[in-house]
């Protein structure tokens, strides 16, 4: 079942998704789509990365984290009730059926009437799994899309991995609540 995340109308929503690049420069293409992850690709793509850049995005959707270090978490600016629903983060590992797919459920709550301290990110439930990718030798083919074979180790929760990481510090500094 999907992990659930919440945000209020008018806030920025944050949908976490992570992987570890096999090697510097060998980033894995990632797509984000609205709707559950289909068999291939992402449906209703809102943002896409390639081996180095964000190469497609639609307004209000962006990557605020260190996406070149594997933090491909999606920020949705100024959400409305219409932004509620399932989002797919797909790590497009080279090879047949190697992709890692994460379905994240975004629940948008109406804005509170009483003023409250602004929070940029509001997390609920657990973080999605973190991916560790390891390369087996250099990529020698002549296309940007060709990367080394990657062996994935899934890690059930991100929390322990983040104890002293930069992301943990970022979360602390942002004042985000982890429930």
């Amino acid at each position: 079942s999907e992990v659930e995340y919440r945000a209020e109308v008018g806030q920025n929503a944050y949908l976490p998704c992570f992987y570890t690049p096999a090697a510097p420069g060998n980033l894995v293409p990632v797509c984000w789509g609205k709707g559950a992850c289909p068999v291939f690709e992402c449906g209703n793509v809102v943002l896409r990365t390639d081996e180095r850049d964000v190469n497609y995005w639609t307004s209000r959707y962006w990557l605020n984290g260190d996406f070149r270090k594997g933090d491909v978490s999606l920020t949705i600016e100024n959400v409305t009730l219409a932004d509620s629903g399932i989002y797919c983060c797909r790590i497009q590992i080279p090879g047949i059926m190697n992709d890692e797919k994460f379905n994240l459920k975004l629940v948008i709550k109406p804005a509170k009437v009483t003023p409250a301290p602004t929070r940029q990110r509001d997390f609920t439930a657990a973080f999605p799994r973190m991916l560790t990718t390891r390369g087996h030798g250099p990529a020698e083919t002549q296309t940007l899309g060709s990367l080394p074979d990657i062996n994935l180790t899934q890690i059930s929760t991100l929390a322990n991995e983040l104890r002293d990481s930069r992301l943990a510090n970022d979360l602390r500094d942002s004042g985000a609540t982890i429930r």
Partner: antibody, heavy 120, light 107 residues
Amino acid sequence: QVQLVQSGAEVKKPGASVKVSCKASGYTFTDYYMDWVRQAPGQGLEWLGYIYPNNGGTSYNQKFKGRVTMTTDKSTSTAYMELRSLRSDDTAVYYCARGGYYSYYSYDYWGQGTTVTVSS
Amino acid sequence: SIVMTQTPKFLPVSAGDRVTMTCKASQSVGNNVAWYQQKPGQSPKLLIYYASNRYTGVPDRFTGSGSGTDFTFTISSVQVEDLAVYFCQQHYSSPYTFGTGTKLEIK
């Protein structure tokens, strides 16, 4: 220490091609992207594209697509940028610049620049 | 492509002044902004990467800040050797684009 040494100045006629070289030393050539940036006289900086020497992957600025080709020779740790169908507004200093993973692909080292003059 | 609007174009300064220049991206670029210094006849030099990280060997009088669309570059106490043109650059998405530059000149 890291060095990027570019080829010498070129004078070309409109319609001709130019090929600028950039020899890298002091680091593992295949571990870093090589980008190319140009600067017209008295103007700002304009990105042409990049090549990843590890696998030859390239990405070009749409503005130059079809006119620019970037290649590398791993055996000599040299990157090349060829620009075809030259026009007078291609007159500029052309720089190679190393795109560093650890600096989020900003350019931590630059070549000294190659002046390309396009004139009839 | 993403437009980087850099202001001001010229900045008259005296030694010891604190100066600030800004760069505004036409859409969000996260923290993927770098600042470069270029002196006449020289190649650009990287000062700040990923919006706020000072590059190795860069004096701590140079600082960068910002995220999303608005970025600031500050020199806390201008030295004579800082007279140069400063460029911002986004490297979030290609084509990577630069600001038009801010030229520091003597008052």
